[in-house]
């Protein structure tokens, strides 16, 4: 059984200065621990690389209402 | 952490309407998408209504389109459900949810919840 007491915590002390264009977007995820110095979304590129992002920026909120909206239509 | 108050619930008759909100504070209201969900008395909490960051796009359930509408505020930190044609099988506790994680209507991807405001539909 893991402690998840112990378990990691993955922070972003540094945030893209770069828009990232949706279509190379695979999904996200939000680090709200705050055992962080910042709130943060984590996306995946659909080359898996992460990359830090500020949730208070629109063009990250565009970019997490569209990878939303992909989860609830069938792909194909 | 984000803190969610839900109010505007009550007793209602069969046909009538209610205006539910959820006032947000804490993190940045405007980074999550936001959704209704619902539990009657010996039932599973079931997925209401869920509304896009920017607010441009709302999913609803079977259960309740055409009759409700969600819509947020992102300057007042608030979310709201306009309930119209209410029927007594839309008696149930009414939670608002902040979602964090990637998903759409599944409560699993919603990190933040209120404590639920009762609604009750009278025939």
């Known amino acids: 059984q893991p402690d998840a007491i112990n378990a990691p915590v993955t922070c972003c002390y540094n945030f893209t200065n770069r828009k990232i264009s949706v279509q190379r977007l695979a999904s996200y995820r939000r680090i709200t621990s705050s055992k962080c110095p910042k709130e943060a979304v984590i996306f995946k590129t659909i080359v898996a690389k992460e990359i830090c992002a500020d949730p208070k920026q629109k063009w990250v909120q565009d970019s997490m209402d569209h990878l939303d909206k992909q989860t609830q239509t069938p792909k194909t | 952490e984000v803190q969610l108050v839900e109010s505007g619930g009550g007793l209602v008759q069969a046909g009538g309407s209610l205006r539910l909100s959820c006032a947000a504070s804490?993190?940045?209201?405007?980074?999550?998408?936001m959704g209704w969900f619902r539990q009657a008395p010996e039932k599973e909490r079931e997925f209401v209504a869920v509304?896009?960051?920017?607010?441009?796009?709302?999913f609803y359930s079977n259960s309740v389109k055409g009759r409700f509408t969600i819509s947020r505020d992102n300057a007042k930190n608030t979310v709201y459900l306009q309930m119209n044609s209410l029927k007594p099988e839309d008696t149930a506790v009414y939670y608002c949810?902040?979602?964090?994680?990637?998903?759409?209507?599944?409560?699993?991807?919603?990190?933040?919840w209120g404590q639920g405001t009762q609604v009750t539909v009278s025939s």
């Open positions: 949810a902040a979602g964090a994680q990637i998903g759409w209507a599944e409560a699993s991807t919603y990190d933040y």
């Open positions: 804490g993190r940045t209201f405007s980074s999550y998408r």
């Open positions: 509304i896009t960051r920017s607010g441009s796009d709302q």
